[in-house]
């Protein structure tokens, strides 16, 4: 057979015996001559021994490029392939010679008393046990032990070939310690040499370092690195480590196999590197290599060694965080330090604890940020070893998209008397304050009850074309006042007012406020009526437990059948762009109320009295009147707000102060509550009375003491009282300096 590609076209060497297989008996002479076209060499079985004296290769007497191989008295072990080839090429002619020796049917290996067969447990892999035969057609079986098992050729995966040996799936003999071939000749058994079975694997699945990353230590500490190699079964592993100071005197390496669950197709090996008393020179890359011989895998990790424990903030630590209400806010504590610091968060000096709304850890997370979360957050890092502390302040600013308070609006369902001047108000709360508030309008009939539009309770006005109030043609004459700023319920709000100079046309008005984080809008139904008129007696919002009367006045010659109703609860507009229901077109939710009728010369007056008003009495009250001629019903609505009773509180502290004789003292005491409290001042627990030197202004809110004297020194108390109780604040005024003796000013304070 030809192997390789020669540079010149050559014929194969020609053998004197023109056969592929030659069978001869033991003790006879084997002689084969080979002729060719260039220098020839012979190869024969076992010619690697070098001590083979029986084989003779001679030049032919009758020509160039010819060699004869002679073996006198052949033995069974001479069985095998005899090859004649051209030097330095793969061109060769081969003859396979069987030396039949029935006393030794298996060819013995040259030097071994036993052989080794290496196998893997791979189900698909076969192994060849090289028990070659000196006879081609022997009946050979394979014996494996222990326990003893015999395998016989099955014409499929188990077979014996005299030139090759016994082939068998490797997993069948993986349990065995040794195997040998056995031949039966004339009821006589002949055995080959023993072959030791060595099961080998080589594949390494992975090499894992633990800890795998972020290893930090300070000088003097102990480093322990574990390197685990996961392999297939029957694998042996060599470990090696590479690290900055490989000559380390405190280094300790321990390698061991780890137990794996039985039935596992995996084996684990562990190598542990320990360095006691680590130094700065040990900082660097640590690499573990695991090797089975056929496969090497490596993994690395960086070990950082610090001179001493420390803590510091990272450069990326923020100082200002901006968020919008409802968002999730994450403020990470970015630090450098070893060991990792303890992290504590504070808000305005108060420690923060984690709960369902806030998580205070490496990252401060506020699940749904609200306005009250605005403030200064301090993060304090503490090194657990050195106790060194570092602090950093983060200001959180929470933006609020414009919110237009319902109670700040004229009722969404109020009715307005024809021809009157009216003021519509939008009170906007937003952070930052709105950069603009715009007003728009639309005729009521353009919006409501158009048959082409599906009108729902939640969106009864399918308004599309809002017009700017600058364009009031066909509507009411309008003037937009300049925005005002007011402190309402402790919040800075922007108040935009729209003045309707004469209520002539029913319309819808919309105010829209926009700031950097969003927009808000409110729609006001401005229903103009020529019908009855509602007034409140007394003409102010009542407080709980006060009495109030709602008067409905109608021209007796025009209207009859005056009736009071209360409007039942309606779904409030909840989405931007939703509009209030025009109440007079929807009388299904009215509750009839008891009322008393009075009359004067021109009008009927229906009075509905609320004694001891409660918060439940709040709502929309409807007065219905019927036109005497047309019988058409007219309704007017008035929103009643009942103020909650609130005990007095005093905002702002009265501060202790020191003043020099002859100077003035000015202090203020702002009280709130409902009903509004009365303010009184005391000096050293005695009522303070106004005189030429003591001035009380703004309902006693502001106290001025002019040209103070030594006797003005003392404890001053501001007390705010109502039926719900009192609140008080105190301050001590110290007067410094010598008293001037003068008759120019007789300054008697009555205490």
């Amino acid at each position: 057979a030809s192997v390789g590609l020669p540079s010149v076209s050559l014929d194969l060497p020609r053998l004197s015996i023109q056969k592929d297989i030659l069978t001869i008996k033991a003790n006879t002479t084997l002689q084969i001559t080979c002729r060719g076209q260039r220098d020839l060499d012979w190869l024969w079985p076992n010619n690697q021994s070098g001590s083979e004296q029986r084989v003779e290769v001679t030049e032919c007497s009758d020509g160039l490029f010819c060699k004869t191989l002679t073996i006198p008295k052949v033995i069974g072990n001479d069985t095998g392939a005899y090859k004649c080839f051209y030097r330095e090429t793969d061109l060769a002619s081969v003859i396979y010679v069987y030396v039949q020796d029935y006393r030794s049917p298996f060819i013995a290996s040259v030097s071994d008393q036993h052989g080794v067969v290496y196998i893997t447990e791979n189900k698909n892999k076969t192994v060849v046990i090289p028990c070659l035969g000196s006879i081609s057609n022997l009946n050979v079986s394979l014996c494996a032990r222990y326990p003893e098992k015999r395998f016989v050729p099955d014409g499929n995966r188990i077979s014996w070939d005299s030139k090759k040996g016994f082939t068998i799936p490797s997993y069948m003999i993986s349990y065995a310690g040794m195997v040998f071939c056995e031949a039966k000749i004339n009821d006589e058994s002949y055995q080959s040499i023993m072959y030791i079975v060595v099961v080998v694997g080589y594949r390494i699945y992975d090499v894992v370092l633990s800890p795998s990353h972020g290893i930090e230590l300070s000088v003097g500490e102990k480093l322990v690195l574990n390197c685990t190699a996961r392999t297939e079964l029957n694998v042996g592993i060599d470990f090696n480590w590479e690290y900055p100071s490989s000559k380390h005197q405190h280094k300790k390496l321990v390698n061991r196999d780890l137990k794996t669950q039985s039935g596992s197709e995996m084996k684990k090996f562990l190598s542990t590197l320990t360095i006691d008393g680590i130094t700065r020179s040990d900082q660097g890359l640590y690499t573990c290599a695991a090797s089975s011989g056929l496969m090497t895998k490596k993994n690395s990790t960086f070990v950082r060694v610090h001179e001493k424990p420390f803590v510091a903030f990272g450069s990326g630590m923020e100082s200002l965080v901006e968020a919008t209400v409802g968002e999730r806010v994450r403020i990470p504590a970015k630090y450098l330090g070893y060991p990792p610091p303890e992290i504590k968060w504070y808000k305005n000096g108060i420690p923060l604890e984690s709960n369902h709304t806030i998580k205070a850890g490496h990252v401060l997370t506020i699940m749904e940020v609200s306005e009250r979360d605005t403030g200064n957050y301090t993060v304090i890092l503490t090194n657990p070893i050195s106790k060194e502390k570092q602090s950093h302040v983060v200001s959180l600013v929470v933006y609020v998209p414009p919110q237009i308070g319902e109670k700040s609006l004229i009722s969404p369902v109020d009715s307005y008397q024809y021809g009157t001047t009216q003021t519509l108000t939008c009170t906007v709360y937003a952070i930052p304050p709105p950069h603009h508030i715009h007003w728009y309008w639309q005729l009521e009939e353009e919006c409501a009850n158009e048959p082409s539009h599906a009108v729902s309770v939640t969106n009864p006005y399918p308004c599309e074309e809002w017009r700017s109030v600058e364009d009031f043609q066909g509507g009411n004459k309008i003037e937009v006042n300049k925005n005002q700023f007011a402190l309402i319920e402790g919040k800075n709000k922007t108040v935009s007012t729209l003045v309707i100079q004469a209520a002539n046309v029913s319309a819808l008005y919309k105010c829209e406020a926009v700031n950097k984080v969003g927009r808000g809008e409110r729609v006001i139904s401005f229903h103009v009526t020529r019908g009855p008129e509602i007034t409140l007696q007394p003409d102010m919002q009542p407080t709980e437990q006060e009495s109030v009367s709602l008067w409905c006045t109608a021209d007796r010659s025009t209207f009859e059948n005056l009736t009071w109703y209360k409007l039942g609860p309606q779904p409030l507009p909840i989405h931007v762009g939703e509009l209030p229901t025009p109440v007079c077109k929807n009388l299904d939710t009215l509750w009839k109320l008891n009322a008393t009728m009075f009359s004067n010369s021109t009008n009927d007056i229906l009075i509905m009295e609320l004694k001891n008003a409660s918060l439940q009495d709040q709502g929309d009250y409807v007065c219905l009147a019927q036109d005497r001629k047309t019988k058409k019903r007219h309704c007017v609505v008035r929103q009643l707000t009942v103020l909650e009773r609130v005990a007095p509180t005093i905002t702002g502290n009265l501060e202790n102060q020191t003043t020099s004789i002859g100077e003035s003292i000015e202090v203020s005491c702002t009280a709130s509550g409902n009903p509004p409290p009365q303010i009184m001042w005391f000096k050293d627990n005695e009522t303070l009375v106004e005189d030429s030197g003591i001035v009380l202004k703004d309902g006693n809110r502001n106290l001025t003491i002019r040209r103070v004297r030594k006797e003005d020194e003392g404890l001053y108390t501001c007390q705010a009282c109502s039926v719900l109780g009192c609140a008080k604040v105190e301050a001590f005024f110290i007067i410094e300096g010598a008293q001037e003796k003068t008759n120019l000013e007789h300054h008697h304070h009555h205490h």
């Epitope: 893997t120 791979n122 698909n124 892999k125 080998v200 080589y202 594949r203 699945y205 042996g236 592993i237 060599d238 470990f239 090696n240 590479e242 690499t287 290599a289 695991a290 090797s291 089975s292 011989g293 056929l294 496969m295 090497t296 895998k297 490596k298």
Partner: antibody
Framework: EVQLVESGGGLVKPGGSLKLSCAAS????????MSWVRQTPGKRLEWVAS????????YYADSVKGRFTISRDNAKNTLYLQMNSLKAEDTAVYYC??????????WGQGTTLTVSS | DIVITQTPLSLPVTPGESVSISCRSS???????????LNWFLQRPGQSPQLLIY???TRASGVPDRFSGSGSGTDFTLKISRVEAEDVGVYYC?????????FGSGTKLEIK
């Protein structure tokens, strides 16, 4: 720069012995498995032997098993192949190769062995 | 042992054109870890082999993206798009799924 330099090749008679060396530089020798691969005159590549990083585990092709021995000296950054009972079919260029993940990522320039009488 | 058959034995090309070299294995090289253990090497004239592709399709470091490997469990292809003069040499594939690791017989790429 990774370098592998083989030496020790030459002409040997059948049955003779020879030892090949491979000097490694430019990388941490003791962290890589090493192998010998040969290329026959017909240009076929044949894996010959491999050794683990510490030298504890060795593997051989069936054709050289029992005749060749692979070894390494990590202190000298050198890989060896001791070849005994040489045959004509061992004639080839012998390369040493660095192994990682089973892959031969760097090869030497090769040394030639000729087995001939 | 796993037998690797490479085709063609010789491949004459014109610079700039794309070529494919095939490699077939007598057994699937897809291992149970989901990886296909087939490598490609290039041996330039007078040089030692160099690793081009490992795990069937991953380029070794420094190998241009003109070289790409693909295939299934037993049939594999090395594609060279826009052949350059420096690409001449013998290309070998090698299996690593089963010991002993075996090589293909080689494909000689030469410029026409």
């Amino acid at each position: 720069e990774v370098q592998l330099v083989e030496s020790g090749g030459g002409l040997v008679k059948p049955g003779g012995s020879l030892k090949l060396s491979c000097a490694a530089s430019g990388f941490t020798f003791s962290m890589y498995g090493m192998s010998w691969v040969r290329q026959t005159p017909g240009k076929r590549l044949e894996w010959v032997a491999s050794i683990s990083i510490g030298g504890s585990y060795t593997y051989y092709a069936d054709s050289v098993k029992g005749r060749f021995t692979i070894s390494r000296d990590n202190a000298k950054n050198t890989l060896y192949l001791q070849m005994n009972s040489l045959k004509a079919e061992d004639t080839a260029v012998y390369y040493c190769a660095r192994e990682l993940d089973g892959n031969y990522d760097y090869w030497g320039q090769g040394t030639t062995l000729t087995v001939s009488s | 042992d796993i037998v690797i058959t490479q085709t063609p034995l010789s491949l004459p090309v014109t610079p700039g054109e794309s070529v494919s070299i095939s490699c077939r294995s007598s057994k699937s090289l897809l291992y149970k870890d989901g990886k296909t253990y087939l490598n490609w090497f290039l041996q330039r004239p007078g040089q030692s082999p160099q690793l081009l592709i490992y795990l069937m399709s991953t380029r070794a470091s420094g190998v241009p993206d003109r070289f790409s490997g693909s295939g299934s469990g037993t049939d594999f292809t090395l594609k060279i798009s826009r052949v350059e003069a420096e690409d001449v040499g013998v290309y070998y594939c090698q299996q690593l799924v089963e010991y002993p690791f075996t090589f293909g017989s080689g494909t000689k790429l030469e410029i026409k």
